[in-house]
Interface confidence: low
C-alpha cells in the first residue's frame, strides 16, 4: 500500500482514486467504473464507431487514436482552415481539392482530367481507352483489331496512334470520289493494263486480275528461260523462227544462207512488223526456188527431205506471224511465182474463199479458231512452184488396203515411174494448228497442166515422215472432178496439197479408180 | 529458272546486329513484293517483314518492329535484312521468299540460320 | 504466335488419304485465299497450292485443296513415302498491317 493512499497497482491507462481503487483514464473503459482488482483492464474506447456520439462532419474520416480521436479529411478534400485534425462537425472545414488543377500531367497523354467530388477521372481522347489495369492511363484503341471491322471490305484497315485508316490493298485504287484513308474508303480493282501501271515486257499482253494483273506472250510466242507464262515477269520470245532452222546432215550453201535471212528476221522481229517480215521470207523462199544452187546437187531423198522441211516451217511461220496482222484479206506475189492469199478476221460463221492464180481454197472459217483462243482466226493459202522441183518423183504412198488392190489388177502402175506433178505446190494454214480432221472438208480447185488423156489423176497431199522427210498420200483426200486441166479436190484435213497424175491406163470404169479416190 | 539466294547468317551475341542479303535471279525483281519469313528451331514459320515492288509499302511483325529494317536494291536484285538489338528469340532459320501482292510466297531461298547466344 | 489452327500430326499408310485442317477466322482465312507449303526435311518450304486449290506446275493433282467459311484443308491422295513432311496453311491476316500469317504445321508420317 501507497503510504499516501494511492493503489499502485492500477492497470494501464488507468489512475487511482485511492489506496484501494483506480479509474480508467479518458477514452478508456473497464468492465466496471471502479477498479477494485489488479486483473482489470482499461480498454481503449473507439469513439468512431457507428453507436458513438462523435460526428465529424462531412467530406471527413473519424481515425481512432489510443485513448482519443481524431477527424481528418476525406482524400480528396482539405481543410480551409489548415488544421490537420478537428474534434467535431463545428470545426469542419474540408472542402474538395481540385487534383486536375493541381497536377495537370494527372492522366498522362491522351487523356483529359476531370474533377469529381473527392477525386478525378480521366477521359480519353477519341480512339483512346482507359487501361483496365492503370485507369488512369489512356492507351490506343486497335479499331482494326477490336471487332468494329470499320472499314469497307475492298480495303484494308492500318491502325494508328489514336485512329486508323481504311487502305486501298495493293493493285486497288478508290472508287471515283472516294477518299484513301478514312473509314469510308472504298476501294475498287486497278485495272493496271489500261492504266499503263503495269511492268509487262513488250513481248507480253497485259491481263488484269482482282487485285494485279498478268502478262501472258503475244499470240506466236512463248515463255523464255523457263519463266511460266502469265507471270509478272514473263518474257516471251517469238517461238515462229525458234524451229525453222536447216535440216540435219543437209550440206547446201544456199540452204544455209536461206536460214540466216530467216534467223535475222526472226532476230529483229517485232509484232509490228509481221507484214512486213512474212513478205521478207516468202520473197527468200522465192528466190531460192528460183535459183537453188547447190540444193539441186543433193541426193533426191535429201531434197524431198528440204522440201518436206521448207512447207512445214513455212506453215508454222505463217501460222504465227499473221496472228499479229490486223484484220483484212492480204494478196503478195512474187517473181518465181510464189502467191500468198491470206485472210484475218475476228471469228465469223461464213466460209471463206482464197483466190489464187493456179488455185482456190473455200473452207468454213469455224475451223480457224481453236475454241478459247482469244487472237483473230486466220486462214492462208500459199502457192509455190518452185517446190515442184525439189519434190520432183517424190514417192506416192497408198493405204495397204488400196496398194493390195492395185497390185492385183494394175502392175504396172507405180512401177513405170513416179507419179508427174501435175498443179503448183501449195500450202493451207489456220490460226488453229489441230487440223488433223476438219468438222467440215475444205475444197481446194486446182488449174494445172493438161492431163495425158487415160492416166488417172490424184488429189494428194504431203505427208512429213517420222525421219524429216516424207511422201505424197491419198488419205483423206478424194478427187471431186477433173477436166483436162483443172481438177477439184476435197479434204478432211490440211497440210500441204497437189495434183499427181500416176502412170497407168484408165479403162472405162474400173473399180479399182473408184478405191483410189 | 527463279533462284533466291541467301547469305549473312551466323552467330551474335544478344544486344549485336546481323545483316541478312538475298540475291534474285531468273525474274523481274523490281515486280515483285519481297519478304522474309523465319522459323526457330523446332518450331513453325513466322512472318517477320515484307516490302513493296518500288519500297512504296514497308511493313513488319510486332515482335520484330523497331529493331529489324527490310530494304531492297532493285538495281542489285537484292533484298536485305537489318536484324539490330537482336535477343535470343531471334534465333532462328530465316528465309526470304518472293511473293505477289496478295498472294502466295511462290519461291523461297535456302535459308540463313541466325544464332543469338551469349 | 500462330493464327490458324493445325492438328500436329497425322499419320497414314502409302497408298491412303489424308486431310489437314487449317481453321482461321473471319479477319484471315474468311476474308482471303489460303495457300499450303510443303516442308521436306532440312529443306525450305515449298509453295504446293494456292488461291485455295490451284496447283503451281509441277505439283502432282495428288494434292488438292478447299476452303469452307474460315477453315481450310488440303488433301493428299496415294500418299507417298516422299510426302513425308511438315505441311503449313498461310493467309493474308487484315487484323495485321500487311501480315501474312502461318499455321502451326502439320508432320505428316508415313508408316
Known amino acids: 500500500q501507497d503510504s499516501r493512499g494511492c493503489a499502485r497497482w492500477c492497470p494501464q491507462d488507468s489512475s487511482c482514486v485511492n489506496a484501494t481503487a483506480c479509474r480508467c483514464n479518458p477514452g478508456f473503459s473497464s468492465f466496471s467504473e471502479i477498479i477494485t482488482t489488479p486483473m482489470e483492464t482499461c480498454d481503449d474506447i473507439n469513439e468512431c464507431a457507428t453507436l458513438s456520439k462523435v460526428s465529424c462532419g462531412k467530406f471527413s474520416d473519424c481515425w481512432n487514436t489510443e485513448g482519443s480521436y481524431d477527424c481528418v479529411c476525406s482524400p480528396g478534400y482539405e481543410p480551409v482552415s489548415g488544421a490537420k485534425t478537428f474534434k467535431n462537425e463545428s470545426e469542419n472545414t474540408c472542402q474538395d481539392v481540385d487534383e486536375c488543377q493541381q497536377n495537370p500531367r494527372l492522366c498522362k497523354s491522351y487523356g483529359t482530367c476531370v474533377n469529381t467530388l473527392g477525386s478525378y477521372t480521366c477521359q480519353c481522347l477519341p480512339g483512346f481507352k482507359l487501361k483496365p489495369e492503370d485507369p488512369k492511363l489512356c492507351t490506343d484503341v486497335n479499331e482494326c483489331t477490336s471487332g468494329q471491322n470499320p472499314c469497307h471490305s475492298s480495303t484494308h484497315c492500318l491502325n494508328n496512334v489514336g485512329s486508323y485508316q481504311c487502305r486501298c490493298r495493293p493493285g486497288w485504287q478508290p472508287i471515283p470520289g472516294s477518299p484513301n484513308g478514312p473509314n469510308n474508303t472504298v476501294c475498287e480493282d486497278v485495272d493496271e493494263c489500261s492504266s499503263g501501271q503495269h511492268q509487262c515486257d513488250s513481248s507480253t499482253v497485259c491481263f488484269n486480275t482482282v487485285g494485279s494483273y498478268s502478262c501472258r506472250c503475244r499470240p506466236g510466242w512463248k515463255p523464255r528461260h523457263g519463266i511460266p507464262n502469265n507471270q509478272k515477269d514473263t518474257v516471251c520470245e517469238d517461238m515462229t523462227f525458234s524451229t525453222w532452222t536447216p535440216p540435219p546432215g543437209v550440206h547446201s550453201q544456199t540452204l544455209s544462207r536461206f536460214f540466216d535471212k530467216v534467223q535475222d528476221l526472226g532476230r529483229d522481229y517485232k509484232p509490228g512488223l509481221a507484214n512486213n517480215t512474212i513478205q521478207s521470207i516468202l520473197q527468200a523462199l522465192d528466190e531460192l526456188l528460183e535459183a537453188p544452187g547447190d540444193l539441186e546437187t543433193l541426193p533426191r531423198l535429201q531434197q524431198h527431205c528440204v522440201a518436206s522441211h521448207l512447207l512445214d516451217g513455212l506453215e508454222d511461220v505463217l501460222r504465227g506471224l499473221s496472228k499479229n496482222l490486223s484484220n483484212g484479206l492480204l494478196n503478195f506475189s512474187y517473181p518465181a511465182g510464189t502467191e500468198l492469199s491470206l485472210e484475218v478476221q475476228k471469228q465469223v460463221d461464213r466460209s471463206v474463199t482464197l483466190r489464187q492464180n493456179q488455185a482456190v481454197m473455200q473452207l468454213d472459217w469455224n475451223q480457224a479458231q481453236k475454241s478459247g483462243d482469244p487472237g483473230p482466226s486466220v486462214v492462208g493459202l500459199v502457192s509455190i512452184p518452185g517446190m515442184g522441183k525439189l519434190l520432183a518423183e517424190a514417192p506416192l504412198v497408198l493405204e495397204p488396203e488400196k496398194q493390195m488392190l492395185l497390185h492385183e489388177t494394175h502392175q504396172g502402175l507405180l512401177q513405170d515411174g513416179s507419179p508427174i506433178l501435175l498443179s503448183d505446190v501449195i500450202s493451207a494454214f489456220l490460226s488453229n494448228n489441230d487440223t488433223q480432221n476438219l468438222s467440215s472438208p475444205v475444197t481446194f480447185t486446182f488449174s494445172h497442166r493438161s492431163v495425158i488423156p487415160r492416166q488417172k489423176v490424184l488429189c494428194v497431199f504431203w505427208e512429213h515422215g517420222q525421219n524429216g522427210c516424207g511422201h505424197w498420200a491419198t488419205t483423206g483426200c478424194s478427187t471431186i472432178g477433173t477436166r483436162d486441166t483443172s481438177t477439184i479436190c476435197r479434204c478432211t484435213h490440211l497440210s500441204s496439197f497437189a495434183v499427181l497424175m500416176a502412170h497407168y491406163d484408165v479403162q472405162e470404169e474400173d473399180p479399182v479408180l473408184t478405191v483410189i479416190t | 529458272e527463279v533462284q533466291l539466294v541467301q547469305s549473312g547468317g551466323g552467330l551474335v551475341k544478344p544486344g549485336g546486329s546481323l545483316r541478312l542479303s538475298c540475291v534474285a535471279s531468273?525474274?523481274?525483281?523490281?515486280?515483285?513484293?519481297m519478304n522474309w519469313v523465319r522459323q526457330a528451331p523446332g518450331k513453325g514459320l513466322e512472318w517477320v517483314s515484307s516490302?513493296?515492288?518500288?519500297?512504296?509499302?514497308?511493313y513488319y511483325a510486332d515482335s520484330v518492329k523497331g529493331r529489324f529494317t527490310i530494304s531492297r536494291d532493285n538495281a542489285k536484285n537484292s533484298l536485305y535484312l537489318q536484324m539490330d538489338s537482336l535477343r535470343a528469340e531471334d534465333t532462328a532459320v530465316y528465309y526470304c521468299?518472293?511473293?505477289?501482292?496478295?498472294?502466295?510466297?511462290?519461291?523461297w531461298g535456302q535459308g540463313t540460320l541466325v544464332t543469338v547466344s551469349s | 504466335q500462330s493464327v490458324l489452327t493445325q492438328p500436329p500430326s497425322v499419320f497414314a499408310a502409302p497408298g491412303e488419304k489424308v486431310t489437314i485442317s487449317c481453321s482461321g477466322s473471319?479477319?484471315?482465312?474468311?476474308?482471303?485465299?489460303v495457300s499450303w507449303y510443303q516442308q521436306l526435311p532440312g529443306t525450305a518450304p515449298k509453295l504446293l497450292i494456292y488461291?485455295?486449290?490451284k496447283r503451281p506446275s509441277g505439283i502432282p493433282d495428288r494434292f488438292s485443296g478447299s476452303k469452307s467459311g474460315t477453315s481450310a484443308t488440303l488433301g493428299i491422295t496415294g500418299l507417298q513415302t516422299g510426302d513425308e513432311a511438315d505441311y503449313y496453311c498461310?493467309?493474308?491476316?487484315?487484323?495485321?498491317?500487311?501480315?501474312?500469317?502461318f499455321g502451326t504445321g502439320t508432320k505428316v508420317t508415313v508408316l
Open positions: 521468299a518472293r511473293r505477289e501482292y496478295g498472294g502466295p510466297f511462290d519461291y
Open positions: 531468273g525474274f523481274i525483281f523490281r515486280s515483285y513484293s
Open positions: 516490302i513493296s515492288s518500288s519500297s512504296s509499302y514497308i
Open positions: 473471319s479477319s484471315n482465312i474468311g476474308n482471303d485465299y
Open positions: 488461291d485455295n486449290n
Open positions: 498461310g493467309t493474308w491476316d487484315s487484323s495485321l498491317s500487311a501480315g501474312y500469317v
